[in-house]
């Protein structure tokens, strides 16, 4: 799976979309999880309604919401009041049994609020060991990153 980068502004909401084949994943609940390290487990943040037929109902866990358009095949996650600590690698998942298929790998980047003059050092950037190949950026203006390109400016 390629990694798609979604950029949001601190303090605002960020909407992440994960398209999928609606027939292939028919009847399956979905989930949004946070990757603990590039090779680590993916920790469940929120999942769609226990009844698949009610997947269109928005479910919240803290400031994160999930809703699933099962007919159109789009899972939507909303991160409300985006904070620097929300930045990182996530996955959209399709659940079957106790297993999960990855629908999309997502890198959330939190940008400074241009109206907020606090120290930009509070914002998150990937460390030297973190690089995401074939990343694709999704925000108001999209661009695809070159292979191997680090999707953030250096911290220094």
């Amino acid at each position: 799976h390629n990694t798609t980068v979604f950029q949001g502004v601190a303090g605002q909401s960020l909407q992440v979309s994960c398209p999928y084949d609606s027939m292939k994943h028919w009847g399956r609940r979905k989930a949004w999880c946070r990757q603990l390290g590039e090779k680590g487990p993916c920790q469940r943040v929120v999942s769609t309604h226990n009844l698949w037929l009610l997947s269109f109902l928005r479910r919240w866990n803290g400031s994160t919401a999930i809703t699933d358009d099962t007919l159109g095949g789009t899972l939507t996650i909303t991160l409300r009041n985006l904070q620097p600590h929300d930045a990182g690698l996530y996955q959209c998942q399709s659940l079957h049994g106790s297993e999960a298929d990855t629908l999309r790998k997502v890198l959330v980047e939190v940008l400074a609020d241009p109206l907020d003059h606090r120290d930009a050092g509070d914002l998150w950037f990937p460390g030297e060991s973190e690089s995401f190949e074939d990343a694709h950026v999704e925000h108001s203006i999209s661009r695809s990153l070159l292979e191997g390109e680090i999707p953030f400016p250096p911290t220094s």
Epitope: D21, K24, W26, R29, L51, L95, H96, S98, E99
Partner: antibody, heavy 123, light 107 residues
Framework: EVQLVQSGAEVKKPGESLKISCKGS????????IAWVRQMPGKGLEWMGT????????RYSPSFQGQVTISADKSISTAYLQWSSLKASDTAMYFC????????????????WGQGTLVTVSS | DIQMTQSPSSVSASVGDRVTITCRAS??????LAWYQQKPGKAPKLLIY???SRQNGVPSRFSGSGSGTDFTLTISSLQPEDFATYFC?????????FGQGTKLEIK
Amino acid sequence: EVQLVQSGAEVKKPGESLKISCKGSGYSFRSYWIAWVRQMPGKGLEWMGTIYPGDSDTRYSPSFQGQVTISADKSISTAYLQWSSLKASDTAMYFCARSRTFYYDSSDYFDYWGQGTLVTVSS
Amino acid sequence: DIQMTQSPSSVSASVGDRVTITCRASQGISSWLAWYQQKPGKAPKLLIYAASSRQNGVPSRFSGSGSGTDFTLTISSLQPEDFATYFCQQADSFPRTFGQGTKLEIK
């Protein structure tokens, strides 16, 4: 009426190749996973792997990975199971089965089965 | 892999009897379990899915129960056509695995 019709019985020699088929009808073939299940003579059922004909996404049981190839041609609603070099131990009945997800359960079960293809490998 | 163990491996019973077959998973599988019936020379037939849901067209004398690791298939009043081999199967994780089967014979 949903039907899975498998190709006929085969008698082969060790080392030969073989491709058996499973043709679906009465439903949208591309939209359901198809599994292959082995039953050796007088024995139980073994799940070999599964394929989604819509995009040919395939999963194998570790026991069968590298031993067989599962494929599908959605244009003719047919799934395949093939061997490049048969062994005597491949002698068995092979079933294809449609995998259906039940929406209040979010897992999948084999709701329709083919009639089976008997493969005999003997020198 | 999850191991599925059925008991008994065979059972003799008469028409009208109540029969219970059990299936134990080597680890918890929630309610992701199916029961199949197979007659000689035929393909298996789905009877029960999600541990307790009857497949369309399956007679009400067949019922399933259990969750976690222990499951049962009950036939409340045996009919002549019920003499067959029954398999449980976990749908929790890959690879999918089946029990070794329980052969139901006429006493």
